[in-house]
């Protein structure tokens, strides 16, 4: 999943959780598969750069092997760099694993703008801050990118946590996460938590951008407030779901809901921004110039180039709407709805701020695949992904980034007939060609 | 077609108040399309942005002369109008008055300028 | 901050020669640049905006190039009324604040 807009979200210590804790409320969720509770030892254990990707520190072959990997639920493949490249500190050395075995297979990934293609074979995996266990893994070793890797992000490969049909060359490769829950007895479920950083930071706190958790096997309870509220997984490919509204501060874009999921509503955790179809986008960027009327941005500022920059600490959050996406809910007929504050959708970018100023990327664009929900949604919640279940719940992040205004919410449920209609069926055509728009 | 034209006093004394407006001919200073600009030239020297507006009245200064900055609109009579408060001999300058165009990016039309003198 | 330098200070060229001025940006502003004329006793004159596009009534011997940290502005032949100083400008954060120092390029 390209973050930068599909990064790899092509950003580390987290400190305290940003922002202010909201009370919990009562758990109202029937029981969950997997362990309940405290996962300590995956907490904060990813870290990042601001628009760069969240990455996981993994470790592949005997003797390990330590590697930072990028956290895409957008992609199927786990793949790491495995040759010398400008922008790789280290990379997976195959032949100093006594426990690689090859696969005798090529593999070949493109990308609207660039690509990477490598060697198939299996290797030991294990996560230091996850689940302690070691599983056999289908590994893509990189040998040749273009245009994949980013300078100064720190991760030196990709784990795609999304499912086998969309895996590359076929959905004949088992993705790591199905081989680590056949191979062991972790609960086929995982959550994420994505701290932005929420403020520019300067080059020595950009060593320590962002942080966040990924949790494998279960929820952590610490890392929300509220409750969860589940939508149905529409396929298993993508993360897909089905979104049937769309509201800008409370003001209904009044859109057929089938023009939101046209031609996917997909959860990503490899893009950085809200990708919205072309319709959709226009739409909202409108009602959010509407809303912010007092001020004036440039042309670009809107098309996610120009950056916008206020004296520190002085962004005027309040001139910017909150953005409301209604999800598909787990019983008929009823909806709920996740609000992201502009703290989420204004992305500060910390390489030209000064002290003297805060400066902001708007991180909502246009897609040509579909809705994306990514790290600019993500950040806002904590996400179950319960794969057992086949569905996906949210949450309000216990890190998300707010004022004493307003808060990143997920509320329900709400009464919306006919759902079943905002999915877009896909004609029935060869699908190999739908991950190469990954912009 | 559109023009724009700054005036006010020449000459200020310093530690007084540096008034100008610039009126705007030709065209309405109340379209949702542009922005409205300060920019000072001392002489001799490159140009140094002092702020703009919008016709709602949300003003962006320059940080190093936000605390003495005050830059108005007044859309009745097609003006705004900058003050600069506390000059000294460095306030000195050719002040000159723009639209900011272009996608609300580039000043792609100025006013002639008038030089401001601060001297006792 | 983004600073912007021009080079050179001074350009000294006869009418007719083709004259090349640089801006370098101290990061990426990925094309959002202008360049403006300014002669002896005028307002600056927008040239270019959006680093290679004319402004409207800008001769076409008026050309700027360039994205990312790097720009040039090229006069293909220089007339007599081009003597004067130019200044880029960065917009790529906004408000427009930045201007380089100018070039100034005058008659051999």
């Known amino acids: 999943t390209h973050l930068g807009i599909r990064l790899p979200l092509r950003s580390g210590l987290a400190g305290p959780p940003l922002g202010l804790r909201l009370p919990r409320e009562t758990d109202e969720e029937s029981e969950e598969p997997g362990r309940r509770g405290s996962f300590v030892e995956m907490v904060d254990n990813l870290r990042g750069k601001s628009g760069q990707g969240y990455y996981v520190e993994m470790t592949v072959g005997s003797p390990p092997q330590t590697l930072n990997i990028l956290v895409d639920t957008g992609s199927s493949n786990f793949a790491v760099g495995a040759a010398p490249h400008p922008f790789l500190h280290r990379y997976y050395q195959r032949q100093l694993s006594s426990t690689y075995r090859d696969l005798r297979k090529g593999v070949y990934v493109p990308y609207t703008q660039g690509k990477w293609e490598g060697e198939l074979g299996t290797d030991l995996v294990s996560i230091p801050h996850g689940p302690n266990v070691t599983v056999r893994a289908n590994i893509a070793a990189i040998t040749e990118s273009d245009k994949f890797f980013i300078n100064g992000s720190n991760w030196e490969g990709i784990l795609g946590l999304a499912y086998a049909e969309i895996a590359r060359p076929d959905d004949s490769l088992e993705p790591f996460f199905d081989s680590l829950v056949k191979q062991t007895h972790i609960p086929n479920i995982f959550s994420l938590q994505l701290c932005g950083a929420g403020f520019p930071l300067n080059q020595t706190e950009a060593l320590a951008s962002v942080g966040g958790s990924m949790i494998i096997g279960g929820i952590d309870h610490s890392l929300y407030t509220g409750r969860l509220w589940y939508t149905p997984i529409r396929r298993e490919w993508y993360y897909e779901v089905i979104i049937v509204r769309v509201e800008i501060n409370g003001q209904d874009l009044k859109m057929d809901c089938k023009e939101y999921n046209y031609d996917k509503s997909i959860v990503d955790s490899g893009t950085t921004n809200l990708r919205l179809p072309k319709k959709v986008f226009e739409a909202a960027v409108k009602s959010i110039k509407a809303a912010s009327s007092t001020e004036k941005f440039p042309d670009g500022f809107w098309l996610g180039e120009q950056l916008v920059c206020w004296q520190a600490g002085t962004t005027p959050w309040n001139i910017f709407p909150v953005i409301s996406l209604y999800l598909m809910g787990e019983v008929t007929n009823q909806s709920f709805r996740i609000t992201i504050l502009p703290q989420q959708y204004l992305r500060p970018v910390e390489d030209v701020a000064t002290s003297q100023d805060d400066c902001y990327k708007f991180a909502v664009s246009q897609s040509s695949t579909g809705t994306v929900m990514g790290a600019v949604i993500m950040e806002g919640f904590y996400v179950v992904f319960d794969r057992a279940r086949k569905r996906i719940g949210f949450a309000v992040s216990a890190c998300h980034v707010h004022d004493e205004f307003r808060t990143a919410a997920v509320e329900g449920p709400f009464v919306t007939a006919d759902m079943e209609d905002c999915g877009y069926n896909i004609p029935q055509t060869d699908e190999s060609t739908l991950m190469t728009g990954r912009a | 077609q559109l023009q724009l034209q700054e005036s006010g006093p020449g000459l200020v004394k310093p530690s007084e108040t540096l008034s100008l407006t610039c009126t705007v001919s030709?065209?309405?200073?109340?379209?949702?399309?542009?922005?409205w600009g300060w920019i000072r030239q001392p002489p001799g020297k490159g140009l140094e942005w002092i702020g703009m507006?919008?016709?709602?009245?949300?003003?962006w200064y320059n940080p190093s002369l936000k605390s003495r900055v005050t830059i108005s609109v007044d859309t009745s009579k097609n003006q705004f109008s900058l003050k600069l408060s506390s000059v000294t001999a460095a306030d000195t300058a050719v002040y000159y008055c723009?639209?900011?165009?272009?996608?609300?990016?580039?000043?792609?039309?100025w006013g002639r300028g008038t030089l401001v003198t601060v001297s006792s | 901050e983004i600073v912007l330098t021009q080079s050179p200070a001074t350009l000294s060229l006869s009418p007719g020669e083709r004259a090349t001025l640089s801006c370098r940006a101290s990061?990426?502003?990925?094309?959002?640049l202008a360049w403006y004329q300014q002669k002896p006793g005028q307002a600056p004159r927008l040239l270019i905006y959006?680093?290679?596009k004319r402004a409207t009534g800008i001769p076409a011997r008026f050309s700027g190039s360039g994205s990312g940290t790097d720009f040039t502005l090229t006069i293909s032949s220089l007339e007599p009324e081009d003597f004067a100083v130019y200044y880029c400008?960065?917009?790529?954060?906004?408000?427009?604040?930045?201007f380089g120092g100018g070039t100034k390029v005058e008659i051999k």
């Open positions: 400008q960065q917009v790529y954060t906004w408000p427009p604040r930045t």
């Open positions: 723009a639209r900011v165009g272009h996608g609300v990016s580039y000043f792609d039309l």
């Open positions: 507006i919008y016709y709602s009245g949300s003003t």
């Open positions: 990061q990426s502003v990925s094309s959002y």
């Open positions: 030709g065209g309405s200073i109340s379209s949702s399309s542009y922005y």
């Open positions: 959006g680093a290679s």
